[in-house]
C-alpha cells in the first residue's frame, strides 16, 4: 500500500459568542483538511478526532464518524468544526477578547487532529498538530492558511 497523506490546511472560520455574566468565550472553529489517497484502491475515512488546546489546556473536542470514502489516486477536502469554551480559570481571557481599543484579538491555539482510515480491513491513523491564530474578538472567515501561527509574540495575558 502507498501512503494516505493528511494535510491540515488551516482555520476556515471562527464564530465567537460570549456569556457576559460568566466571562466565558465560546468559539466555534471550523478547520479544513486535505486527505490524499495515493493508492490504486478506495479508502474509507472512518473518523476524525480533533481537539483544541489553549495554554496547554484542552478547550474543545470533536469527533466525526463515517465521513467519506476517497477513490483511487484522489483527494478530498474535509471541513470539521470544534466547539471550544474558554472559561473557569482561563476566563480572564475575556478581558482581552472584549477589549474594544484593539481591532484584532488574536490568540494562539494548538489544533490537533487524528484521521483514521480503513482499507481491506486494515486501519491506519495519521495525526497532525499545528499552532494557529484565531481572533476571539469577532466572527472571522479566513483565507486558507491565513491564520497560521508564525514565530511572533503571543498577546500578554
Amino acid at each position: 500500500p502507498r501512503s494516505i497523506d493528511v494535510k491540515y490546511i488551516g482555520v476556515k472560520s471562527a464564530y465567537v459568542s460570549y456569556d457576559v455574566q460568566k466571562r466565558t468565550i465560546y468559539l466555534n472553529i471550523t478547520n479544513t483538511l486535505n486527505i490524499t489517497n495515493n493508492n490504486y484502491y478506495s479508502v474509507e475515512v472512518e473518523n476524525i478526532t480533533a481537539q483544541v488546546q489553549f495554554a496547554k489546556t484542552v478547550i474543545g473536542k470533536a469527533r466525526l464518524n463515517n465521513i467519506t470514502h476517497i477513490g483511487p489516486l484522489d483527494m478530498k477536502q474535509i471541513d470539521y468544526t470544534v466547539p471550544t469554551v474558554i472559561a473557569e480559570e482561563m476566563s480572564y481571557m475575556y478581558d482581552f477578547c472584549t477589549l474594544i481599543s484593539i481591532k484584532v484579538h488574536n490568540i494562539v491555539l494548538m489544533m490537533q487532529v487524528t484521521v483514521t482510515t480503513t482499507y481491506f480491513g486494515h486501519s491506519e491513523q495519521i495525526s497532525q498538530e499545528r499552532y494557529q491564530y484565531v481572533d476571539c474578538g469577532r466572527n472571522t472567515t479566513y483565507q486558507l492558511g491565513q491564520s497560521e501561527y508564525l514565530n511572533v509574540l503571543q498577546p500578554q495575558q
Partner: antibody, heavy 123, light 111 residues
Framework: EVRLQQSGPELVKPGASVKISCKTS????????MNWVKQSHGKSLEWIVN????????FYNQKFKGKATLTVDKSSNTAYLDLRSLTSEDSAVYYC????????????????WGQGTSVTVSS | DIVLAQSPASLAVSLGQRATISCRAS??????????VHWYQQKPGQPPKLLIY???NLESGVPARFSGSGSGTDFTLNIHPVEEEDAATYYC?????????FGGGTKLEIK
Amino acid sequence: EVRLQQSGPELVKPGASVKISCKTSGYTFTDYYMNWVKQSHGKSLEWIVNINPNNGDAFYNQKFKGKATLTVDKSSNTAYLDLRSLTSEDSAVYYCAREGQLRLRRVYAMDYWGQGTSVTVSS
Amino acid sequence: DIVLAQSPASLAVSLGQRATISCRASKSVSISVYTYVHWYQQKPGQPPKLLIYLASNLESGVPARFSGSGSGTDFTLNIHPVEEEDAATYYCQHSRELPYTFGGGTKLEIK
C-alpha cells in the same frame, strides 16, 4: 486631557422622563466602554449599565431594566441616559464614567468620571 | 448579586498615622491571578476618583501612600501616612460579574 462633561441639573415631575447627556473629549470615544452610576443623597453608589460605544451593546443591572436606557452618538462622542416613569426614588446624582483599561486587557474600573447630573423628582 | 461589606462605616485617624479600611465580598471576586476589586475616594460635591484597580494596582497620579491588598473575598485599603487632604469617603467596587456593586462606604476623618 480626558473630559466627561455632563448636562445640567433636572427638576422633573413624577411619571415624566428625562434624558441626560455625557459629552466626552480627549480620547477615542469608541475605544472605551462607558458606564452610568447612580448616587442617592447621602448614600452609596449603584452601577446602572455599561455600553460598548462601537456597536451599542449595553449590559444592564437588572434593577434598572425598564427604568434606564443607555444610548450613544458616535458622531458627537456623547453618551445618553434616558430615565422614564420617574418617582422620588429616582432622585439622585447620576454619573457617567469611562471604563479604564491596560494595554491588552480590560480592568472594569472607572478611571474618569463626569461631574454628575442631579435629577430631582418632585411635584 | 455580590454584596460588598465595608468596615468600619467611619473612622478617625490622626495625621501621619495609618488608616485601614476593609471590604469583604459575599463570594470570591478573583479569577486565576486576577482580582476584580477597585477602590475609590469621594469628597463632598465631587465625583468618585479611582485610587486602586485590580486589588493592588495604584492608579496613575495617585500618591504612593495609598495601597491595596487582598484576594478572594477579603480586601484592604491602607493609607499611610494619612494627610489632611485624605478626609473623604472611600468605596470598594467589584467587577467580577454583572451587576457590578459598591461597598457602603467608609468615611475617613482626620484628627
